[in-house]
């Protein structure tokens, strides 16, 4: 029961996280104009990964897409790539994890297969979360660097009477959404990996034949070994010792009244 809950919760947390990563990637407010000494502004600038926007005090908003690919900073391209990789991995992870869910039964899928799928999706979620966190952090670092550079420029090179006020940008809402979403996806992935451990059967190697000593002495009969070995028609042991090939997880794969998980 705990394994199912862990897996289900991991799935839900990852789903929320990936939705957040998608939202953050699409958001325009990755960087917003720093209002340092002017809390009310007539023209407010903010930028996303795909376009930059200007909102006037009247409410008028104008957004312009970055219609160039080669002219964009390499860092921005890297952030875009990281976020897209995060989304793609997350989406694949979600798809895989749906089939891996213990509560969803598809044909006669074995628990070992579900465990592997759970682990795969978990790893995908972890990498997806890390990609998002890395992307957001790279962008944040870029902002911090540019912020201090523009601050330095504001107080130097003013030569004449005319001031050119450089627009400084600070962290936008998308960064916080991205960090939280990345963290959630990461946590979801870890939960899926933990759930995988519970799903995976404890592999007991039954390939070595187990001989039970019979209660009475057995005379050697050249005709065969049916008398007391475990290979005969001993129905009591058949399920476990059927050729030494079947393991416990196969036993579990048939629903029975003892199948609580």
């Amino acid at each position: 029961m705990a394994v199912t809950a862990c897996q289900g919760l991991g799935f839900v947390v990852s789903l929320i996280g990936i939705a957040g990563i998608i939202a953050a990637t699409c958001m325009d407010q990755w960087s917003t104009q720093d209002l340092y000494n002017n809390p009310v502004t007539a023209v407010f600038n903010y930028q996303g990964l795909w376009r930059s926007c200007v909102r006037e005090s009247s409410g008028f908003t104008e957004c312009r897409g970055y219609f160039t690919l080669l002219g964009l900073p390499a860092m921005l391209q890297a952030v875009r790539a990281l976020m897209i990789v995060g989304i793609v991995l997350g989406a694949i992870g979600l798809l895989v994890s749906i089939f891996a869910l213990k509560c969803i039964r598809i044909g006669s899928m074995e628990d070992s297969a579900k465990a592997n799928m759970t682990l795969t999706s978990g790893i995908m979620f972890i990498v997806s979360g890390l990609c998002a966190i890395a992307g957001v952090s790279v962008f944040a670092n870029m902002l911090v660097t540019n912020f201090w550079m523009s601050t330095a420029n504001m107080y130097t090179g003013m030569g004449g009477m005319v001031q050119t006020v450089q627009t400084r940008y600070t962290f936008g809402a998308a960064l916080f959404v991205g960090w939280v979403a990345g963290g959630l996806t990461l946590i979801g992935g870890v939960m899926m990996c933990i759930a995988c451990r519970g799903l995976a059967p404890e592999e007991t190697n039954y390939k070595a034949v187990s001989y039970h000593a019979s209660g009475h002495s057995v005379a050697y009969k050249p005709g065969g070994f049916k008398a007391s070995t475990g290979f005969g028609s001993n129905t009591k042991n058949k399920k476990i010792y059927d050729g030494g090939a079947r393991t416990e997880d196969e036993v579990q794969s048939y629903p029975s009244k003892h199948d609580y998980v």
Epitope: A42, V43, Y46, S57, F60, E62
Partner: antibody, heavy 119, light 113 residues
Amino acid sequence: QVHLQQSGAEVVRPGTSVKVSCKASGYAFTNYLIEWIKKRPGQGLEWVGVINPGRSGTNYNEKFKGKATLTADKSSSTAYMQLSSLTSDDSAVYFCARTRYGGNAMDYWGQGTSVTVSS
Amino acid sequence: DIVMTQSPSSLTVTAGEKVTMSCKSSQSLLNSGNQKNYLTWYQQKPGQPPTLLIFWAFTRESGVPDRFTGSGSGTDFTLTINSVQAEDLAVYYCQNSYSYPFTFGSGTKLEIK
């Protein structure tokens, strides 16, 4: 047809206060900012402040803080500017104007209200 | 606050002439976000409220005759009236519409001979 109708001329005593009104018609009052401008004889235009009638948010020129108070009544589509502790320096024509959607420019103006402070 | 300086303070021309008036701002009015200059021109005829002529430095308001042209960027702006008409007798104001508080130039008074 957008129209901003301002209240009539006022002659007031020094130290008192006056409330100038600006009734808007022909557009959605809460969707546009209303700005107030002061014009003294022989001088240029002076920006007093702005109000967002939709959420009653205001922004004042530092020079007019404590002097002017901007309010708006959504039900009557009317913006108000109250001037307090009047002195002769406050004698001027006051205009209300609507901010156009784009450019932060004032596209429609009231006819102006003359305020004369005299003892 | 941004200081707006207009020149000349007045000018007298004959009808049909081309007129240019200047407006300078103490800070750049160019917004990097949309590459637009937040400078507005108004015309105020005697006994009337001002009317909007040009916004974003060179975008004419609807209904404004095309003889009115705005130009310039950053801190230096110009209003040009091609072939001045008698009805253009007015005071012309430039305004910073980039940052609060909005500030106006002292105006250029246009007189017709």
